[in-house]
């Protein structure tokens, strides 16, 4: 729900967005994701920090944990044991990388209203979780895994070889966390808590990235991270499973790697429990166009996990890499052997398939020139998924239900017509057996979260509608937004244009291109945002455009895999093509065009500025990649292959920003990087700067001491203030 446009008579009461609004988060929105604990119950942390249990069917709610108890240990998070006897309270949160953090954990006994004393947990803990049934605890401390049968029991140590930066048990190393698992954990309970599976990552032979952390001491600290760059030695991964009922009896049992995977360098990509005695592992060759899904069964009489070749399913891409950003994970059906999975169909669109015996015999469940994005839940009679099918807008997400109990299966869009103008981009969260679900709408209007009946899809109640935000925006002149497409040489370029509130097509406006452009990304989405670019349009009168070019996602493999082995070419070309089309529209001042991006977007913006087209007056690169030889192996090689002579070294060398240093002579370039960037290392910007200096090209730069890839905290304010000054100067806008 966007506030309706006001008439001129009221415009004097309206104000433009200010930079301060953005930096203060004045117009941020809330979402409501229930913490489901059964088919009809969920937990939620109330505004006053009580943990409240809601029963949808009785309509009752009660506080299971008071804010007083939370405050007593400064808890910022909690977790209820499945038997509802204990709650862990998390405090002393200390961020590590994107997902990982350490914390102190306290166990609160709900039956006697006291903290569990004796055999307290060590600190800080790297990961902790309850078993799915009962109240067993698994946790990782100093890279080793421990098990408690009950919170007050002494721990049983499962692994002993954990060593900082060398051996990681139950948690991923840097590259697996960031580029493969996208989690802080690498351990998985079986559905009833009988077995615990975990990964061991051996980083002993991985080269280390070292950078200074300046801090406040006389001497800076050196941060060392085993970080495999493209072509370097990778972590060695092994998967183990232990029986948690009798952990000392047999000990951890290693799961065999499929022979076709083990024959060369490989990755483990995910683990999915099917039943307590059946597990599904996914593996990937280092050259990431072959993935193997292996279903393994526990053989009690041998105390071993058997992974028959007949239960190995191969997924191979002949036109690019396997999967989208990641290889999709299976969702098993009730027979515990067949599953649903998203992969490319014969026309090159990612769709849901049903695999009963072999991938070759897979039954295609969805089809069309659009893509299935996520399978949320499979019940005995329904499959819930999201796609961008509706009205052929790739940047939308709607939730669909397919009835799998009937033949032919019927499809229903659950969300398409609920709040059609306000809500075009949804995600969902389902209770056990999909008895109920929450829909979270991200826009394009003001976000709203609602609760629904899983059988009838009827809306039960609004969980969060952001009324305060709606009211706060009533006197704000928000920019106009439009999502449209350009057809260029058989390529469809979707774009989002953000226009000043009093936009007049007969006038000329400065244009800022905001680019990300990384493989399998999508920038043009029908979502709500009041952010820096909203301010630039609202207050500074700029037109901002975002363009999804070749390499971006959810429009088929032809567009997605176009950049395979050629990063830095078509993504840049397509931004330039779009700019030329925007100029043709007649309202762009072609002497005032800028481009900016962060991370992959910083790489693309740099290459666009150095393209020699003369289109861009200025641009900004924040934390850019400058050479693919400097970035992580798992990510880089997925799209580029290996930096070796017999593979793709030539394009690695040709696609650097440094190779184009001369071309920056005729643009104003602002280069920004955090010195403690664990992800895109400061090295990248240091090398750009060196090349520009060597070429005697003037440029502007800003570093952020001890800041990582996110440039958070006070750095954020400084960053956006600095970039605003730079752009206003470039566009000759008065301060």
């Amino acid at each position: 729900l966007r506030p309706s446009r006001v008439h001129n008579s009221e415009e004097n009461t309206m104000r433009a967005l200010t930079l301060k609004d953005i930096l203060n988060g004045t117009f941020s929105y809330k979402t409501f994701f229930p913490n489901w604990i059964s088919g009809q119950e969920y937990l939620h942390q109330s505004a006053d920090n009580n943990i409240v249990l809601y029963n949808i069917e009785t309509g009752q709610s009660y506080t299971i944990l008071s804010n007083r108890t939370m405050k007593s240990v400064n808890a910022s998070n909690y977790g209820l044991s499945p038997d509802r006897q204990f709650v862990y309270l998390e405090s002393d949160y200390s961020k590590l990388w994107r997902y990982s953090y350490t914390a102190t954990y306290y166990i609160y006994d709900l039956s006697n209203g006291e903290f569990v004393r004796g055999n307290e947990l060590p600190r800080p803990i790297q990961y902790l979780c309850w078993s799915p049934v009962g109240s067993k605890l698994a946790y990782v401390y100093q890279n080793n895994i421990y098990l408690k049968q009950r919170p007050g029991d002494p721990p049983f140590q499962i692994t002993f070889n954990g060593r900082e930066n060398k051996i990681f048990n139950g948690i991923p190393d840097w590259v697996y966390e960031e580029e493969m698992l996208a989690t802080k954990y690498a351990l998985w309970w079986s559905p009833n808590g009988k077995f615990l599976a975990y990964a061991e990552f051996n980083d002993t032979d991985i080269p280390v990235i070292a950078y200074s952390y300046y801090g406040d001491e006389q001497y800076p600290r050196t941060i060392n991270i085993p970080y495999p760059k493209a072509g370097a030695k990778n972590p060695v991964v092994r998967i183990f499973i232990i029986d948690t009922t009798y952990p000392a009896y047999v000990g951890p049992q290693e799961v065999p790697v499929p022979a076709m995977i083990a024959s060369s360098d490989y990755y483990f990509s995910w683990l999915t429990w099917v039943t307590d005695e059946r597990v599904c592992l996914q593996w990937l060759k280092r050259v990431q166009n072959v993935s193997v899904l292996s279903i393994c069964d526990f053989r009690e009489d041998w105390q071993t996990w058997d992974c028959p070749k007949t239960q190995e399913h191969i997924e191979e891409s002949r036109t690019g890499w396997a999967g989208g950003f990641f290889v999709s994970t299976p969702v098993f059906s009730y027979d515990a052997i067949s599953y649903y999975k998203i992969f490319s169909d014969k026309d090159g669109y990612k769709h849901i398939h049903y695999i009963k015996d072999t991938v070759e015999n897979a039954i295609q469940i969805t089809s069309g020139k659009w893509e299935a994005i996520n399978i949320f839940r499979v019940t005995q009679d329904s499959l819930f998924y999201s796609s961008n099918e509706f009205e052929e807008y790739p940047g939308r997400r709607n939730i669909y239900r397919i009835s799998i109990g009937s033949y032919p299966p019927s499809k229903k869009c659950v969300t398409c017509h609920l709040r059609k103008e306000r809500c075009q981009y949804y995600t969902a969260s389902f209770s056990d057996y999909a008895k109920y679900y929450a829909l979270v709408c991200y826009g394009p209007g003001i976000p709203i979260s609602t609760l629904h009946d899983g059988r009838t899809d009827q809306e039960i109640k609004i969980l969060e509608e952001n009324k305060e935000l709606e009211n706060a925006l009533k006197n704000i002149q928000l920019p106009k937004e439009e999502i449209k497409k350009l057809e260029v040489d058989e390529i469809t370029l979707w774009y989002k244009m953000i226009l000043p509130p009093q936009f007049d097509r007969s006038k000329k406006y400065p244009l800022l291109i905001q680019v990300y452009g990384g493989p399998c990304s999508q920038s043009v989405r029908s979502v709500f945002a009041v952010n820096w670019i909203s301010y630039l349009a609202s207050k500074e009168g700029m037109v901002i455009a975002l363009v999804d070019g070749r390499g971006t996602a959810f429009q088929g493999d032809k567009l997605l895999y176009a950049v395979y082995r050629k990063l830095g070419v078509y993504e840049v070309e397509d931004q330039i093509t779009a700019v030329r089309k925007f100029i043709e529209m007649g309202f762009i001042d072609e002497k005032r065009i800028a481009i900016w991006g962060w991370s992959y977007g910083g790489y693309v913006s740099s290459l666009a500025l150095a393209s020699g087209t003369g289109l861009f007056k200025c641009g900004i690169a924040v934390a850019p990649v400058s050479s693919w030889e400097y970035y992580a192996s798992v990510y880089t090689e997925r799209f580029m292959g290996l930096p070796t002579k017999d593979d793709n070294l030539e394009h690695y060398k040709n696609s650097t920003v440094m190779a184009r240093a001369e071309y920056f002579r005729n643009v104003d370039y602002l280069l920004i990087h955090g010195t403690a960037d664990d992800n895109v290392h400061f090295q990248n910007s240091a090398q750009i700067a060196k090349a520009l200096v060597n070429a005697q090209v003037d440029f502007q730069a800003m570093w952020y001491s001890d800041q990582n890839h996110g440039l958070s905290g006070l750095s954020t304010n400084h960053l956006y203030t600095h970039m605003t000054h730079f752009l206003k100067q470039c566009f000759s806008l008065s301060d």
Partner: antibody, heavy 121, light 107 residues
Framework: EVQLVESGGGLVQPGGSLRLSCAAS????????MIWVRQAPGKGLEWVSA????????FNADSVKGRFTMSRDNSKNTLYLQMNSLRAEDTAVYYC??????????????WGQGTLVTVSS | DIQMTQSPSSLSASVGDRVTITCRAS??????LNWYQQKPGKAPKLLIY???SLQSGVPSRFSGSGSGTDFTLTISSLQPEDFATYYC?????????FGQGTKVEIK
């Protein structure tokens, strides 16, 4: 190349002891259960002992229970069979073999060349 | 323990002959049956697993069939290198048990 190489066989007196070793290479040793099978001169194959991949679980044929102990050292990719209280009927060629659950139901897909144990006074 | 009984215990055949060996389990073992070939002084070699699946590298003249309690190994056209002893083995339950062997000799 995937292979198993046994060693440690020889002549031993009744009541004596012997330790057989089996060195594995070419595969992830710790992922697989292993077995010892023996073959008395001119006779068929007889399973003797088995061990899980972790080494935490072993089981023996009734004929050797209490006398033979199977173990493994995964860090050395080596399998052992400690044979005590040997009898004349234990005379046989002893083979170690890998059990691969990649075959439905499991199968013994890699075998060593065998080592001869002779129990005689 | 599951008993495995092979028949015949030996047979004589000529090159080019079709040879059939049977194996019976004392109880149902589904299709969890493997066949091995052993030549004098050598270790056994896996030929067929899961009753009918051919191990890689094994010539296609070897085939297996059966399920439950009755199984068959067939050599469609006997070759000189096929003269050996053949063992069946059940992998349905522990302990793993072998048949007593069938010796295929030159006629």
């Amino acid at each position: 190349e995937v292979q198993l190489v046994e060693s440690g066989g020889g002549l031993v007196q009744p009541g004596g002891s012997l330790r057989l070793s089996c060195a594995a290479s070419g595969f992830t040793f710790s992922s697989y259960a292993m077995i010892w099978v023996r073959q008395a001169p001119g006779k068929g194959l007889e399973w003797v002992s088995a061990i899980s991949g972790s080494g935490g679980y072993t089981f023996n044929a009734d004929s050797v229970k209490g006398r033979f102990t199977m173990s493994r050292d995964n860090s050395k990719n080596t399998l052992y069979l400690q044979m005590n209280s040997l009898r004349a009927e234990d005379t046989a060629v002893y083979y170690c073999a890998k059990r691969d659950g990649g075959y439905e139901g499991g199968a013994f897909d890699i075998w060593g060349q065998g080592t001869l144990v002779t129990v005689s006074s | 323990d599951i008993q495995m009984t092979q028949s015949p215990s030996s047979l004589s055949a000529s090159v080019g002959d079709r040879v059939t060996i049977t194996c019976r389990a004392s109880q149902s073992i589904s299709s969890y049956l493997n066949w091995y070939q052993q030549k004098p002084g050598k270790a056994p070699k896996l030929l067929i697993y899961a009753a009918s699946s051919l191990q890689s590298g094994v010539p296609s003249r070897f085939s297996g069939s059966g399920s439950g309690t009755d199984f068959t190994l067939t050599i469609s056209s006997l070759q000189p290198e096929d003269f050996a002893t053949y063992y069946c083995q059940q992998s349905y339950s522990t302990p793993p048990t072998f048949g007593q062997g069938t010796k295929v000799e030159i006629k």
